[in-house]
């Protein structure tokens, strides 16, 4: 009599998560009498997947009616596949007895589960950095299978190359995760820039998933300060202007000091945005020269986004002749400057 064969025609089957998987198995003979059982894995630790006679297997159904006379098809369908179902499935013939004795196993069918990666999540630095500094962004995506995946970084439409990417775990697993870090050099123009992490995987059918981070969350553009003084008015009042330009974010406090004493403090709010996303702000101070005997040292002090204050100072000479008053005289643009206004 010819030896019984247990035939599993497919060496491997690949199924998308959520779909059903069909695992085929036929036998070459009806004898000897005895049941067929399905297992995942081999050896003593194998897991029973389906046994027609007993047990409750809600996700597993036979493809053909196993109670039908002369049935030789013992294929099964597993519904609602998840990555945890991945593994090698064996169709095993037993000889009827007390207990039943394992007679022959099929060659096994490896079930791999195609699972989509989660939407990439991009996180940036915890604290803001200024232009010319390098900041790191991290992109993470999880739960995908198979392991092969492509991740690209862009700053706007320029692909980034200073990138380090890891897929875990290194060995075989039911699903995988990817973590990538990109180093980005900031420029003063980056308030409106975006960093984009793009993940491409076989399950996405060509439509990559994207995660983005706005560089406006990562950048600080410190202000330029310029102090100018208009012509002396007839009523002996001097109008002094402090122009604060090209800063981001908007969080800014400006304090006027007269001879070291606080004259006025203002907070920037609801400023119009420049084309590049930065802000400008102008503050005026009227100084009554006739109320002062000595020269007046004026300081415009700006505290931007919690950073140490930046000062611009100059002196108004009250002892000089008012008629010779200069017009539109500017304090220099770097450091703490004093300028005598005549």
């Amino acid at each position: 009599e010819e030896e019984l064969q247990v035939i599993q025609p497919e060496k491997s089957v690949s199924v998308a998560a959520g779909d059903s998987a069909t695992l085929n198995c036929t036998v070459s003979s009806l004898i000897p009498v005895g049941p067929i059982q399905w297992f995942r894995g081999a050896g003593p630790g194998r897991e029973l997947i389906y046994n027609l006679k007993e047990g409750h297997f809600p996700r597993v159904t036979p493809v053909s009616d196993p109670t039908k006379r002369n049935n030789m098809d013992f294929s099964i369908r597993i519904s609602n596949i998840t990555p945890a179902d991945a593994g090698t499935y064996y169709c095993v013939k037993f000889r009827k007895g007390s207990p039943d004795v394992e007679l022959k196993s099929g060659a096994g069918t490896e079930l791999s589960v195609r699972a989509k990666p989660s939407a990439p999540v991009v996180s940036g630095p915890a604290v803001r950095a200024t232009a010319e500094h390098t900041v790191s962004f991290t992109c993470e995506s999880h739960g995908f299978s198979p392991r092969d995946i492509t991740l690209k970084w862009f700053k706007n439409g320029n692909e980034l190359s200073d990138v380090q990417t890891n897929v875990d775990p290194a060995g075989k697993s039911v699903s995988y995760s990817i973590r990538s870090t990109a180093r980005v050099v900031l420029t003063r123009r980056d308030v409106h820039s975006q960093v984009i992490c793009e993940v491409a995987h076989v399950t996405l059918q060509g439509d990559p998933l994207r995660g983005t981070a706005n560089l406006s969350e990562a950048i600080r553009v410190p202000p330029f300060l310029e102090v100018t003084q208009q012509s002396m008015r007839a009523d002996n009042q001097v109008n002094v202007t402090c122009q604060v330009t090209k800063f981001y974010p908007q969080r800014l406090q400006l304090t006027w000091l007269e001879n070291g004493n606080v004259s006025r403090t203002e907070m920037a709010s609801a400023l119009p945005e420049n084309k590049d996303g930065t802000y400008n702000w102008t503050s005026w101070l009227l100084v009554n020269v006739s109320a002062h005997r000595d020269d007046v040292k004026l300081t415009c002090q700006v505290e931007h986004d919690g950073q140490p204050a930046v000062n611009k100072s100059f002196s108004v000479k009250v002892s000089a002749h008012p008629k010779e008053q200069g017009s539109n005289t500017a304090a220099e643009n770097t450091g703490t400057n004093e300028r005598n206004i005549y």
């Epitope: 092969d148 492509t150 862009f154 700053k155 706007n156 439409g157 320029n158 692909e159 190359s161 050099v185 420029t187 123009r189 820039s193 984009i196 793009e198 491409a200 995987h201 076989v202 996405l204 059918q205 060509g206 439509d207 990559p208 994207r210």
Partner: antibody
């Protein structure tokens, strides 16, 4: 609308240098990489490399390392491609193409270079 | 580097005929980064299909793209005279980016 306009045809002798320009308009130049593609007469397309328009960092394919140079004048929204020590086999049409998240969505009209003694 | 081989190199089709152009890669290419370009004589290439199956702006619906891994194709459901051109596949999945040798499609 978005346009890439390349400089006109060039006729050069072997050993000379050529510099081809590609002027971009209709978008923020520094937000999209610029790629260069060679097409020899009657042949297919060959990707030569690209330049990061923000950092000006070039990337060259191995076949185009040495005599070839990508450069920028970002203030003029213009990318350049230079070949030194020209050889007969450099005879081709050279295209600039915008990169980004949808590679090659806009191309220049091409610059024909003829190298002949 | 990934070499893209297009077949056939030259083919002709009659108006109304279904046409399939293939692009075979020496190693796996992410479908997101497999593009097709159309080029007519004396003109620059035009982006035709991006990310394997998405038609670029203005491309007629009779065009379609499919594939994964190392095998990709561009199909024209019913050939029209305007479709006579050269078609190039392009991968930018991994460096160096490469083009296929092209298929020249002629009208009968």
């Amino acid at each position: 609308q978005i346009q890439l306009v390349q400089s006109g045809p060039e006729l050069k002798k072997p050993g000379e240098t050529v510099k081809i320009s590609c002027k971009a308009s209709g978008y923020t130049f520094t937000h999209y990489s610029m790629h260069w593609v060679k097409q020899a007469p009657g042949k297919g397309l060959k990707w030569m490399g690209w330049i990061n328009t923000e950092t000006a960092e070039p990337t060259y394919v191995d076949d185009f390392k040495g005599r070839f140079a990508f450069s920028l004048e970002a203030s003029a929204s213009t990318a350049f491609f230079q070949i030194n020590n020209l050889k007969n086999e450099d005879t081709a049409t050279y295209f600039c193409a915008r990169g980004g998240l949808r590679q090659g969505d806009y191309w220049g009209q091409g610059t024909t270079l003829t190298v002949s003694s | 580097q990934i070499v893209l081989t297009q077949s056939p190199p030259i083919m002709s089709a009659s108006p109304g005929e279904k046409v399939t152009l293939t692009c075979s890669a020496t190693s796996s290419v992410s479908a997101s980064y497999l593009y097709w370009f159309q080029q007519k004589p004396g003109s620059s290439p035009k982006l035709w299909i991006y990310s394997t199956s998405n038609l670029a702006s203005g491309v007629p619906a009779r065009f379609s793209g499919s594939g994964s891994g190392t095998s990709y194709s561009l199909t024209i459901s019913n050939m029209e005279p305007a479709d006579a051109a050269s078609y190039f596949c392009h991968q930018w999945s991994s460096y160096p980016y490469t083009f296929g040798g092209g298929t020249k499609l002629e009208i009968k």
